[in-house]
Amino acid sequence: MAPWPELGDAQPNPDKYLEGAAGQQPTAPDKSKETNKTDNTEAPVTKIELLPSYSTATLIDEPTEVDDPWNLPTLQDSGIKWSERDTKGKILCFFQGIGRLILLLGFLYFFVCSLDILSSAFQLVGGKMAGQFFSNSSIMSNPLLGLVIGVLVTVLVQSSSTSTSIVVSMVSSSLLTVRAAIPIIMGANIGTSITNTIVALMQVGDRSEFRRAFAGATVHDFFNWLSVLVLLPVEVATHYLEIITQLIVESFHFKNGEDAPDLLKVITKPFTKLIVQLDKKVISQIAMNDEKAKNKSLVKIWCKTFTNKTQINVTVPSTANCTSPSLCWTDGIQNWTMKNVTYKENIAKCQHIFVNFHLPDLAVGTILLILSLLVLCGCLIMIVKILGSVLKGQVATVIKKTINTDFPFPFAWLTGYLAILVGAGMTFIVQSSSVFTSALTPLIGIGVITIERAYPLTLGSNIGTTTTAILAALASPGNALRSSLQIALCHFFFNISGILLWYPIPFTRLPIRMAKGLGNISAKYRWFAVFYLIIFFFLIPLTVFGLSLAGWRVLVGVGVPVVFIIILVLCLRLLQSRCPRVLPKKLQNWNFLPLWMRSLKPWDAVVSKFTGCFQMRCCCCCRVCCRACCLLCDCPKCCRCSKCCEDLEEAQEGQDVPVKAPETFDNITISREAQGEVPASDSKTECTAL
């Protein structure tokens, strides 16, 4: 149950620490220089100095020859300098630059399109199931169930706007109260952060790149989880979100507004609608207990239809079921009444690939899921490659300085808030926090943006997506305006509250430290990234869902001991790192626990054995497949022929290099094992030949 620390020999030393501003970290040397580092697992470990946890940027002063894996890499420019080129070379270089820019924009376009298709694929695979989650009556009384339903539905449909719109329609139809909807919205906020975490997994080929990318993506997850952890109990106790938003909605006389501008969709829709088009109303109908919707396909077949309102005669069990007494009659045997029906006449079929295949939703979804992940991965690799070739030397320095440097004193604190505004603005433009954070992930991976800077951008993205929802709410029809606006405002104030909790004071920026901790673990044990994804986005929500269905007694009976153990472990961990002398000798470290409970090494052995069968089979496969293989089996030799996972990793496998790392990983999340034994970076873990 405990984290995996092996900290018997760690001694606190409050005198030795460095304070560094976010984004002003020294840059690490060239990757190529790191390859000659040796590794000896049995070597004595450099003592790690533990520090008071009051700044996110506090680093441990380690031997100077060791590099911090969180330092941004220097992307060396190996090409000929501009001044040394002749006219022909300059023209060629210029056109190469233009070509790269076009390619970059092209791959970025297909990257965004593949995210859209990925969302459609998830909806086809799990949309109906997601809709059924909503039809659970216990949501009304159990906020925890509402929360996990929000997570699961958003993960299943890969779109917080879809799950939010279902909630809005349920509130408008009085199937759900605003009070019951708030935890679902919180859950949707968590669920939407899975997309960029999936994108981060695509950068698994390079350990140091993966460390940064995964941490950069999961900073969003941790922010959302921590916000919920604090704000859900507060909301349940005080209903502050409900009260504030109700006051706002009631004090303003809103007129129906215009629809939120679809800026990115305008560009991507022409392509994505050729792949697949979905009838998203089906999920909402299932959520609202429409039995007929359960048999409907999500794949849109008819795009042009004519709706004709007509009256038809229908039989009813008795005259009491008649529309009105005057519209009631009998044929002598059965009672009849007149019903208004909307008759839909199909005029023109949609023009997408799957329109004439008549495949089940699951089949279409699976095909699209595989294809979109492949395209997503391929585009990401190409984006990283192009950015890697563009962002070298001076260009990289300028960009990195522009993005990561703070304003001059005394306005340095304003930089982060500007980043929040930028994140919000960018998200408002692209109309999707998933797209924005997913685009940010590879930039964090290749070292253009620091996690410290990505954090406020991500927080801004969370705000941006709620402003879009507010605009969409203002464009709602009269009956849905109040409920949709109140829910959109709840979403907005929840994110504002989260920012107030986890951003203004550097000490409270826990998500950064937790994400870096997870990044370190995942860089060492890459399977842990998938494990984290499954646990946090599927298993925990599904377990809570299952326990909630069993009844609140079962939920409390299981939940309370689990929460108690977690708190106990955290308290013990804190005491071990701050004042171990208070504790009995046995409890001063985790050595009293069996190895499997305090280290990932035994688990790694199990995973390696389990994935061993994949190791030999994935040779000579395409680069994308190889990356997936490397992610699954963490194999150093498996893809030698495609040069994807270099033999170089063999040399780094057993390294034990002490690193300079933010002190709180050691205090809270992460062991020496994950910290110290992770190589600073990989050299060439990407395929050289595409």
Partner: antibody, heavy 119, light 107 residues
Framework: QVQLVQSGAEVKKPGASVKVSCKTS????????MHWVRQAPGQGLEWIGA????????AYNQKFKGRVTMTADTSTSTVYMELSSLRSEDTAVYYC????????????WGQGTLVTVSS | DIQMTQSPSFLSASVGDRVTITCKAS??????VAWYQQKPGKSPKLLIY???TRHSGVPDRFSGSGSGTEFIFTISSVQPEDFATYFC?????????FGAGTKLEIK
């Protein structure tokens, strides 16, 4: 064209039963209800009940409940109406009539069967 | 049961006259009313259903109107073949009931 041909006149003693048949043609037998209406000499029309040949479902006027039985034979497209415990006031012309689909108006009628009840 | 009160019971008219027959329902029947024509020794014949809709093959001199509880049957210009007995019928609820009839005679 739609045709409804009823069985011939019947003379019955009080307490006896009578079974009148109505053979249909010219339409799909199982789609429309078949009504039975009687008319006492010099009197108005009185609805006895109806049968839906498609399922055999029936509905009877409360006045005749327990005394009337309606059946349908889909193989011969014929409906039958049996009235038991006959009384002298049951003397009337009995008509079968096809109900229009979806409502209780009767568009085609049989020629009628005179049932006389006398001792 | 719903009572259908038809008036008048007897009606004398000449060829070319406009005649109206009234039928009153004891409760609201909407428009679930039909009108029939019966000649002596013959079966009834459907003329109007849904209070206003003419059955196929019925001349347009026959028309119906009304809803709720009051219904009117009109022959705009009586023809020699129109002299017969006319019945109204409600099919709003079971049992189906008929009016007592109106006998149209030659004046």
């Amino acid at each position: 064209q739609v045709q409804l041909v009823q069985s011939g006149a019947e003379v019955k003693k009080p307490g006896a039963s009578v079974k009148v048949s109505c053979k249909t043609s010219g339409y799909t037998f199982t789609t429309n209800n078949m009504h039975w209406v009687r008319q006492a000499p010099g009197q108005g029309l009185e609805w006895i009940g109806a049968i839906y040949p498609g399922s055999g479902a029936t509905a009877y006027n409360q006045k005749f409940k327990g005394r009337v039985t309606m059946t349908a034979d889909t193989s011969t497209s014929t409906v039958y109406m049996e009235l038991s415990s006959l009384r002298s006031e049951d003397t009337a012309v009995y008509y079968c009539a096809r109900g229009m689909y979806g409502h209780g108006a009767m568009d085609y009628w049989g020629q009628g069967t005179l049932v006389t009840v006398s001792s | 049961d719903i009572q259908m009160t038809q008036s008048p019971s007897f009606l004398s008219a000449s060829v070319g006259d406009r005649v109206t027959i009234t039928c009153k329902a004891s409760q609201d029947v909407g428009t679930a009313v039909a009108w029939y024509q019966q000649k002596p020794g013959k079966s009834p014949k459907l003329l109007i259903y849904w209070a206003t809709t003419r059955h196929s093959g019925v001349p347009d001199r026959f028309s119906g109107s009304g809803s709720g509880t009051e219904f009117i049957f009109t022959i705009s210009s009586v023809q020699p073949e129109d002299f017969a007995t006319y019945f109204c019928q409600q099919y709003s609820s079971n049992p189906l009931t008929f009016g007592a009839g109106t006998k149209l005679e030659i004046k």
